[in-house]
Interface confidence: medium
């Protein structure tokens, strides 16, 4: 669809005569008839197949034609057509004399024709005017013409329909050739597809309007590039949705079981070395001079009773010092200056001479010891505490401080490792001599049945069209993450494209 435009510029009829040579009375009141038709090698009479147009009287004899309206007529003259412009044409322009006001052909005398010109040729669609001048014996006509497309029609032949739009059906303007030019933020054949926020993950994100980034299930973050871990995941991360990969030192389905008590709680005191020995379990190796489960107790060097023969022990910064009773000397009061005559044996001990009376030996009654029977028997010397328990003298009695996993007066009882119900997900616990063992129910594995090994919902490859499958551990179901262009719970449906424009 387009318009053939003809701009009449100047008509010269100096003598004011008709084509027959007869003069007009009082002058030639001139109007024009235009016929536009298909290309003819020799322009001949016949239907004006592309259209006709007539002007009102534009002037008398010789005159210039104004660019807009003249006596109700239009200049340029418009010859619209509703077909593909063929690129060639024939044009007939007739100048007529109007004796009266009635310009209809049947109202004019046959000799009212002033002049007639006919041209034909090629004409491409375009904005530029072609200037032409036709001269006969008595007249001269100067004019220009062009073909332009109607609104919303484009292309070399005005055959491409395109109307700009910004609605549900598209967001575009039209280029000079009729192709679509998407508005900012839109793409696709009909500019219906929004351009998401820059960096929005291609598979895990989408948008319904430009510069948006909405996340598909299992993904989060401004660009939908962060996976959502399994619900309840405490000290873990994911690389695909619903995973819970434990950080170092943590275990269990939700990474909430502390496997590195040493690092997370630093229980050992006074520079002791900490060793993890299971979930929430540890052992402290004390530096010299310290004792206790957490090495929290400072050892006195006098605790080992190094002074003999009733010597008193005094702690010093660099060790200890023995204060010996009368008759004894030496670092530990081990040397005697007494004999049996001095009655050196205490607590009912019997004295026996040795080396011809140079020294002696005491035979002590039960519960007493020492070279002079001066010491009550140290209840800890016999190492009564079993299983590595630590013996502590407490006045007349003694007590055992047991290692983890043991109890009883002498640490002789093994605490059941199973008492804490360490096996997750209904696993059966078995006490072993050195620890425990879990027998896991179907669907779980690991030292404590903490790893879910249920049937992988993705094993049957339920997703189509190269979609990515994720197993939702909480429901044992799968989620398909569709590539662009596919939809459906299994990505089984291609996205249908809208029908093309009807040209």
């Amino acid at each position: 669809s387009g318009v053939f435009q003809l701009q009449l510029q100047e008509f010269i009829n100096e003598r004011g005569v008709l084509a027959s040579g007869r003069p007009c009375e009082p002058g030639c009141r001139t109007f024009f008839r235009v016929c536009l038709k298909h290309f003819q090698a020799v322009v001949s009479p016949g239907p004006c197949t592309f259209g006709t147009v007539s002007t009102p009287v534009l002037g008398t004899n010789s005159f210039a034609v104004r660019d807009d309206s003249s006596g109700g007529g239009r200049n340029p003259l418009q010859l619209p057509f509703n077909f593909t412009w063929p690129g060639t044409f024939s044009l007939i322009i007739e100048a007529w004399h109007a004796p009266g006001d009635d310009l209809r052909p049947e109202a004019l005398p046959p000799d009212a024709l002033i002049s007639k010109i006919a041209i034909q040729g090629s004409l491409a669609v375009g904005q530029n005017w072609l200037l032409d001048e036709q001269t006969s014996t008595l007249t001269r006509l100067r004019y220009s013409y062009r073909v332009i497309c109607s609104d919303n029609y484009y292309g070399d032949n005005c055959s491409r329909l395109c109307k700009k739009r910004n609605d549900h059906f598209g967001h575009y303007v039209c280029q000079p050739d009729g192709n679509l030019s998407c508005l900012p933020g839109w793409t696709g054949e009909y500019c219906q597809q929004p351009i998401c926020l820059s960096g929005c993950h291609e598979q895990n994100g989408y948008c319904s309007k430009p510069a948006e980034c909405l996340c598909r299930p299992g993904w989060q973050g401004r660009l939908c590039n962060e996976c959502i871990p399994h619900n309840g995941c405490r000290h873990g991360t994911c690389s695909t949705p619903w995973q819970c990969t434990c950080d170092e030192g943590w275990g269990g389905l939700f990474c909430d079981q502390d496997l590195n008590y040493c690092t997370h709680h630093s229980p050992c005191k006074n520079g002791a070395t900490c060793s993890n020995s299971g979930q929430r379990s540890y052992t402290c190796t004390c530096r010299p001079g310290y004792t206790g489960v957490d090495c929290e107790l400072e050892l006195s060097e006098c605790d080992s009773n190094p002074c003999r023969n009733g010597g008193s022990c005094k702690d010093q910064e660099d060790g200890y010092h023995c204060l010996c009773p009368p008759g004894y000397y030496g670092l530990h009061c081990e040397h005697s200056t007494l004999s049996c005559a001095d009655s050196p044996c205490f607590n009912g001990g019997s004295c026996r001479e040795r080396n011809q009376g140079a020294n002696y030996a005491c035979e002590c009654p039960p519960n007493f010891t020492g070279s002079n029977c001066e010491k009550k028997v140290d209840r800890c010397t016999s190492n009564p505490c079993a299983n590595g328990g630590q013996c502590l003298n407490r006045g007349p009695s003694r007590m055992c401080r047991c290692r983890p996993g043991f109890t009883g007066t002498y640490c002789e009882l093994h605490v059941s490792d199973c008492a804490r119900n360490p096996c997750a997900h209904g696993g059966t616990c078995h006490d072993l001599e050195n620890g425990l063992m879990c027998t896991c129910p179907a669907g779980f594995s690991g030292r404590r049945c903490e790893v879910r090994t249920s049937i992988d919902a993705c094993a049957s490859s339920p997703c189509f069209n190269r979609a990515t499958c994720y197993t939702d551990l909480s429901t044992d179901t799968f989620v398909c993450n569709c590539p662009y262009g596919f939809v459906g719970s299994r990505c089984e449906f291609p996205v249908g494209l809208p029908p093309s424009f009807p040209w």
Partner: nanobody, 123 residues
Framework: EVQLVESGGGLVQAGGSLRLSCTAS????????MGWYRQAPGKQRELVAA???????YYADCVKGRFTISRDNAKNTVYLQMNSLKPEDTAVYYC?????????????????WGQGTQVTVSS
């Protein structure tokens, strides 16, 4: 006043199909766009699919590839073919004329909402 009458809804199992029809009485809608909307309980009404006077189409992302909109101007009717239905498609479906700057605006007496047609998809 123009009456919009929707029909074709019903109860269907997931994966099934339905075809909805909407007829405008007392007017011809050749020169303006028509669309199908839906409203699920507790949710806002949303445009699902639309068709313009030159048969350009629009589909919401959630129905692309499953729903097809078409029109029969001679019968003053617009259709919505719904395939591979999902439980989340359950809603009351209405037809009306959405805004389009390409098409004529629907006349002022057009498009007070009809009764709609209930679509229920069971799993």
């Amino acid at each position: 006043e123009v009456q919009l009458v929707e029909s074709g809804g019903g109860l269907v199992q997931a994966g099934g199909s339905l075809r909805l029809s909407c007829t405008a009485s007392g007017s011809t809608f050749t020169s303006y766009a028509m669309g199908w909307y839906r409203q699920a309980p507790g949710k806002q009404r949303e445009l699902v699919a639309a068709i313009s006077s030159d048969d350009s189409t629009y589909y919401a992302d959630c129905v692309k590839g499953r729903f097809t909109i078409s029109r029969d101007n001679a019968k003053n009717t617009v259709y919505l073919q719904m395939n591979s239905l999902k439980p989340e498609d359950t809603a009351v479906y209405y037809c009306n004329a959405p805004h389009s700057d390409y098409d004529e605006e629907a006349p002022s007496d057009f498009g007070s909402w009809g009764q709609g047609t209930q679509v229920t998809v069971s799993s």
